[in-house]
């Protein structure tokens, strides 16, 4: 029970974090004006991945899509690529993960494939949640540089007379959006992965028979490989139980340092 | 048609109250903020502040802080201006003007002017 | 706050001639975000409420006559009117809607001779 419930939650966890990498992608709050010094203002200004939007105090919102491939930074292309991988393999990981699921019967499909589809599924969350705050991060990182760059030259004087206010922009909305949806994904890939270990077949609880050779003393252990999950191959000083072998459901997940984001 | 429509001449004693009223018809009033303009008498126009129709929340002009309150009855599509303790200086032409693209002000009320005198 | 000065003050001119009128602010009032510069002109006569003209510095509101142009950028603006007209002369006012508080210009007189 343990495991279909870990399994579940993870895929409902990795399934709230896509979404919420997919609506930061979209979002146009990336970057928002800063208003430390001035909290009320006739021109608001604001940013996301794709366009670049402004609202006037009369309620007026214009948009403007970032038109050009070239002639955007390479840090939002990067930013752009990372969420965008992101997306797919959270994607291809929930497709893949809805036929993992324990509680989903498909034609004979066995155990062993299950695990294996839960693995590959958690992997794909855990690399799907790492390339959102990846990119956030980036985006984040390119922001604080930028803010304290015209910090530094918030004034720019034509010989003294005339100012020039700079318009510095700090961490939007999309930016927690992201970080969070992203750490659940990530936290949903791990449950996976916990529940793979779980949904492996378990050795057969049989006593081992031996044969004897001439001349030699064979032991044969039947049914002593687990599916090859990478968590359980058949290593060396493997107990086989005689009875009363764990359930695959009592299996203990431990608590993973990313459910301490 | 669009209108603005604003409440008759004052006439006020130094250190009285009025209340100047604002009724907007012809669109929808939670839609576009109402600004307000003072214009002393041969003077320029200087704008006092606004209040969104839509939350209600004023913004005013440093210099009309304080005596100065503009208050909405949304029901009535009417923009309020209250002062208090009346002063010479007040003396004006009180303008409500409609917010619009560009933080342009489209549709003007007719103006009421305001005399304060001992 | 945003000073708006407007040049010249009164200005005399003949009908059919072509004007133009000054509004210089003390910031710049262009948004890098639209790529808009938030400069408003209104135009006021005697005894009646300002006039919206131009808006964005040289966006035409809609029913206003093509004579009037809006140009200019940053902080330095211009209103033209070409072929005067005798129901042009107004007090032409500029104002700063970039930024609180939204200052108007004092004003350009338009006189005939």
């Known amino acids: 029970m343990a495991v279909t419930a870990c399994q579940g939650l993870g895929f409902v966890v990795s399934l709230i974090g896509i979404a919420g990498i997919i609506a930061a992608t979209c979002m146009d709050q990336w970057s928002t004006q800063d208003l430390y010094n001035n909290p009320v203002t006739a021109v608001f200004n604001y940013q996301g991945l794709w366009r670049s939007c402004v609202r006037e105090s009369s309620g007026f919102t214009e948009c403007r899509g970032y038109f050009t491939l070239l002639g955007l930074p390479a840090m939002l292309q990067a930013v752009r690529a990372l969420m965008i991988v992101g997306i797919v393999l959270g994607a291809i990981g929930l497709l893949v993960s809805i036929f993992a699921l324990k509680c989903i019967r498909i034609g004979s499909m066995e155990d062993s494939a299950k695990a294996n589809m839960t693995l590959t599924s958690g992997i794909m969350f855990i690399v799907s949640g790492l390339c959102a705050i990846a990119g956030v991060s980036v985006f984040a990182n390119m922001l604080v540089t930028n803010f304290w760059m015209s910090t530094a030259n918030m004034y720019t004087g034509m010989g003294g007379m005339v100012q020039t206010v700079q318009t510095r922009y700090t961490f939007g909305a999309a930016l927690f959006v992201g970080w969070v949806a992203g750490g659940l994904t990530l936290i949903g890939g791990v449950m996976m992965c916990i529940a793979c270990r779980g949904l492996a077949p378990e050795e057969t609880n049989y006593k081992a028979v031996s044969y004897h050779a001439s001349g030699h003393s064979v032991a044969y252990k039947p049914g002593g490989f687990k599916a090859s999950t990478g968590f359980g191959s058949n290593t060396k000083n493997k107990k086989i139980y005689d009875g009363g072998a764990r359930t695959e459901d009592e299996v203990q997940s431990y608590p993973s340092k990313h459910d301490y984001v | 048609q669009i209108q603005l429509v604003q409440s008759g001449p004052e006439l006020k004693k130094p250190g009285e109250t009025v209340k100047i009223s604002c009724k907007a018809s012809?669109?929808?009033?939670?839609?576009?903020?109402m600004n307000w303009v003072r214009q002393a008498p041969g003077k320029g126009l200087k704008w006092m502040g606004w209040?969104?129709?839509?939350?209600?929340?004023?913004t005013y002009a440093e210099e009309f802080k304080g005596r100065f309150a503009f208050s909405l009855e949304t029901s009535a599509s009417t923009a309020f201006l209250q002062i208090n303790n009346l002063k010479n200086e007040d003396t004006a032409t009180y303008f409500c003007?409609?917010?619009?693209?560009?933080?342009?002000?489209?549709?003007w009320g007719q103006g009421i002017t305001l005399t304060v005198s001992s | 706050d945003i000073v708006m000065t407007q040049s010249p003050s009164s200005l005399t001119v003949t009908a059919g001639e072509k004007v133009t009128m000054s509004c210089k602010s003390s910031?710049?009032?262009?948004?890098?975000?639209?790529?808009?510069?938030?400069l408003t002109w209104y135009q006021q006569k005697p005894g009646q409420p300002p006039k919206l003209l131009i808006y964005?510095?040289?966006t035409r509101e809609s029913g206003v006559p093509d004579r009037f142009t809006g140009s200019g950028s940053g902080t330095d603006f211009i209103l033209t009117i070409t072929k005067v007209q005798a129901e042009d002369l107004a007090v032409y006012y500029c104002?700063?809607?970039?930024?609180?508080?939204?200052?108007f210009g004092a004003g350009t007189k338009l006189e005939l001779k």
């Open positions: 104002q700063n809607v970039y930024s609180y508080p939204l200052t």
């Open positions: 910031q710049s009032l262009f948004n890098s975000g639209n790529q808009r510069n938030y």
């Open positions: 003007a409609r917010l619009v693209r560009g933080n342009s002000f489209d549709f």
């Open positions: 209040i969104s129709t839509n939350t209600g929340e004023p």
């Open positions: 012809g669109y929808t009033f939670t839609k576009y903020g």
């Open positions: 964005w510095a040289s």
